[in-house]
């Protein structure tokens, strides 16, 4: 996402089609308060950022309310009146969906259905990852609505779960960001647990009669 213009690297994140965050890293201007100017319509005058992000006391980014805005962000990063980086970008390329909310678990024997509130826009994947202390890595299952059923679980094992949302690559392109993970929740025998033991307890030896 960065640019070669005067050594300025940029990063754009479009949070949940609501807020755009543009951050910059400009080694040449590391002790300078660069200013950020933007517009959502190519015909309008630029506005200056009113919500700067600071790093070590200097501007390093801008947060913009972009809800119900057009799809293109035109922006200019300036040192005084001198533009050091100018660009226009389709914002959806940099979509980061919000983290799943109201995550619920419904158990039935050796299966669990994980649900959460669907986001208000489409073409998303809802991914559930889960593991027991016996698993060396996370298992994963995803669906295009937040209704994911995982079968073949062992009722006696404790499982950790977390959920996130991803933008479909075929729709939004490959350079989007997955949401943050939901909080990890642990379940055993259909009941919530504080945690799953890090190391599985060894099976009890069978007593000979």
């Amino acid at each position: 996402q960065g640019g070669a213009a005067e050594g300025v690297q940029i990063q754009i994140i479009y949070f949940n089609l609501e807020t755009v965050q543009v951050t910059w890293n400009a080694s040449k201007y590391s002790r300078t308060n660069l200013t950020f100017h933007y517009r959502f319509n190519g015909d309008e005058a630029y506005d200056q950022c009113t919500n700067y992000l600071l790093q070590e006391g200097h501007t390093s980014g801008c947060l913009l309310d972009a809800e119900q805005r057009d799809d293109i962000l035109y922006f200019s990063i300036r040192n005084g009146t001198h533009p050091v980086f100018t660009a226009s970008r389709w914002m959806v390329y940099y979509l980061k969906p919000s983290s799943p909310k109201h995550v619920r678990f419904s158990w039935h024997q050796d299966a669990v259905t994980v649900t959460c509130s669907d986001l208000s826009y489409g073409d998303l994947l809802y991914e559930v990852q889960y593991r027991s202390p016996f698993d060396t890595e996370w298992q994963s299952k995803q669906e295009n609505t937040c209704n994911v059923t995982i079968e073949g679980l062992d009722a006696e094992k404790c499982y950790s779960f977390w959920v996130r949302v991803k933008a479909m690559e075929d729709v939004y392109g490959p350079d989007t960001y997955p949401s943050d993970w939901s909080e990890v929740t642990c379940w055993q025998r259909g009941e919530i647990r504080d945690a799953c033991a890090e190391t599985p307890t060894p099976p009890k030896p069978k007593l000979s009669k």
């Epitope: 035109y74 226009s88 390329y93 075929d170 939004y172 392109g173």
Partner: antibody
């Protein structure tokens, strides 16, 4: 499979206007998620994106051309149109209509028409 | 606008050769770079989308790589039908822009 056929090209005098048509078959131009675009290719072979019209009728134009072009569509005829005014010699090109990949306006163009040649000359 | 620069502008090669064409963007574009092939008198045809994904029906001798600002299109073993002009295109920047083209000719 989508087929696109452009028409309306020909010889135009400088200062004149043109209206190009693009008839789509095998696919509805109102299908959600797809955007339709006009791209032109100059005699020197360079390609220039001109503008989009979406399944939702939203339009986007190349800022360099915005004041001179209008893209529209007729759903009943499953066709799109390019209106271009104040033509000059440097507008001489082959004009293509094309469809973007699913997911919209922002991607690559996977189906193209055969193109129609517009020559601007007195 | 994001400038796209292809190199070389023209290239002579023989059937069976391995050929690489490069495309450089004036600003980083992630992996949103697409490649087209155009034969004389025909419209461009999409070969590769998003830097490395082969479009349906395109032979596997074509491959793409790169991210950020530097990208390559490789034809592993040239076939007679591959002699054509190749264009790259970026899509996250507005407006979308194309490279000037690389003409691949028979040696």
């Amino acid at each position: 499979q989508v087929q696109l056929v452009e028409s309306g090209g020909g010889l135009v005098k400088p200062g004149g206007s043109l209206r190009l048509s693009c008839a789509a078959s095998g696919f509805s131009i109102t299908t959600s998620g797809y955007y339709w675009t006009w791209i032109r290719q100059f005699p020197g072979k360079g390609l220039e994106w001109m503008g989009y019209i979406g399944y939702n009728s939203k339009t986007y134009y190349n800022p360099a051309l915005k004041s001179r072009i209008t893209i529209s569509r007729d759903n009943a005829k499953n066709s799109l149109y390019l209106q271009m005014n104040s033509l000059r010699a440097e507008d001489t090109a082959v004009y293509y209509c094309a469809r973007s990949l699913y997911g919209g306006y922002k991607d690559a163009f996977d189906s193209w028409g055969q193109g129609t040649l517009v020559t601007v000359s007195s | 606008d994001i400038q796209m620069t292809q190199s070389p502008s023209s290239l002579s090669a023989s059937v069976g050769d391995r050929v690489t064409i490069t495309c450089r963007a004036s600003q980083s574009i992630g992996t949103s770079l697409h490649w087209y092939q155009q034969k004389p008198g025909k419209a461009p045809k999409l070969l590769i989308k998003f830097a490395s994904r082969l479009q349906s029906g395109v032979p596997s001798r074509f491959s793409g790589s790169g991210s950020g600002t530097d990208f390559t299109l490789t034809i592993s073993s040239l076939q007679p039908e591959d002699f054509a002009t190749y264009y790259c295109q970026q899509s996250p920047g507005f407006p979308p822009t194309f490279g000037q083209g690389t003409k691949l000719e028979i040696k």
